[in-house]
Interface confidence: low
């Protein structure tokens, strides 16, 4: 006999990186017929929603109107159908950004390199932090974590055209409180010996959405959002 229901998906809209004082919605998608959803924050019950009518709704939303450092942390959700509860969702790491200061990102030996050349990004922030995050616009799997008291090095190694794209970095005051984003640095890689045609960049989110971190595709499925966020958060952990 089935003891639990499948776990729901959890994600944040517009994104799990939320500028302080901005709004965010935590979404939990379970099954039609679920009579109750519970949102847990840092292991404790945070909010409850009971959709009406349950047979026509498979998703609930928990709205946070004013993001701050106290609201940043790990969220999960569960739902029940009748008396049967689901497995808990994956953890959603909700991050507050635009805290305190702005790092500077540079790339060495430069933003225009030949394929095969070794490239290193440097993210610098003079205020007290020890963890840095390098993000490439596009797939969230391009998240790297680095450490240093004022600067972190992010060696990409010998690059290929797959490394082309726009990068930003953040300083992290803790796992869930990040700095303002750096200005963008666009890496151009030319002369790929293995593939002389200009390979397309990874599927990317709209470049102009970085300012507000609306890194979600307009046509993307909700589950895609959830998986996207979860991939990035696993890398952060």
């Amino acid at each position: 006999q089935q003891q639990t229901l499948p776990k729901p998906f959890i994600w944040a809209e517009p994104h799990f990186m939320v500028p302080k004082e901005k709004q965010v919605t935590i979404c939990c998608q379970g099954n039609y017929g679920a009579v109750e959803y519970q949102l847990h924050f840092e292991g404790s019950l945070f909010a409850v929603d009971r959709p009406k009518p349950p047979e026509r709704i498979n998703k609930v939303q928990f709205y946070i109107p004013d993001m701050n450092s106290r609201m940043a942390g790990q969220y999960s959700c569960i739902y029940r159908v009748g008396e049967l509860w689901s497995e808990p969702s994956n953890l959603l790491d909700l991050v507050v950004t635009e805290m305190y200061d702005t790092p500077t990102l540079s790339v060495h030996p430069g933003p225009e390199v030949i394929s095969g050349e070794k490239v290193t990004f440097y993210c610098r922030l003079d205020t007290a932090t020890s963890m840095f995050l390098l993000l490439k616009e596009g797939r969230s799997s391009h998240v790297q974590r680095g450490y240093g008291k004022v600067q972190a090095e992010f060696p990409l190694g010998p690059v290929t055209t797959a490394h082309r794209g726009t990068y930003r970095c953040f300083g992290s005051y803790n796992n869930h409180a990040w700095s303002f984003p750096s200005e963008p640095v666009k890496l151009l890689v030319t002369g790929d010996i293995e593939n002389t045609s200009l390979a397309p960049e990874d599927p990317t989110f709209p470049a102009d959405t970085w300012g507000t971190y609306l890194l979600t595709t307009e046509t993307g499925l909700q589950k895609d959002h959830a998986l996207w966020d979860h991939t990035a958060q696993n890398l952060l952990r």
């Epitope: 500077t104 540079s106 790339v107 933003p111 440097y122 004022v150 200005e183 640095v185």
Partner: antibody, heavy 115, light 107 residues
Amino acid sequence: QVQLVQSGGGLVQPGRSLRLSCAASGFTFDDYAMHWVRQAPGEGLEWVSVIYSGGSTYYADSVKGRFTISRDNSKNTLYLQMNSLSAEDTAVYYCARGAQWLVNWGQGTLVTVSS
Amino acid sequence: DIQMTQSPSSLSASVGDRVTITCRASQGISNALAWYQQKPGKAPKLLIYAASRLESGVPSRFSGSGSGTDFTLTISSLQPEDFATYYCQQHYSTPPTFGQGTKVEIK
């Protein structure tokens, strides 16, 4: 407070070598990138070399293959080994601290290459 | 390498004047620009980094602006101690490169 004290400059004949030192204090030396910048008499600033906290090094084309930057983190000291010197290398040499922008500078040391 | 071009190469101004120095990069450098002040016989002093961020201890009459290729250093009200040579430097890529300098002289 942060201090960078330079030594090792002087008069040297063309083709000879010289080693400059920069003793650092007042900060955690091995956390920072360190640069050498030079200034020929009456001229502007010219970047020479950098060594990052991770150990990677870069050089200006004008000194590549002749100059070597190094650091001894146990002694909080930065070095510039200059070989095959020519008259064009005559300048005041500054060490400086910083990753990209140069926050603190040494007092400078004059290197004169002349026969 | 990225070339940095400053203008003017020199200027004469009086105490209290508003002074503007420009710096142009040969390619886009985002906001990766620093400004330094140098007085004769002394080491340069950092004034501005990341185009507009004032270094600690630098008077607020100094300000920086710009992004991409065009940048400006402004001294809102020139003081006697501000007569010096000013350099811009891009910190976008290696090698970092300096402008040729702008000498601010007393009129």
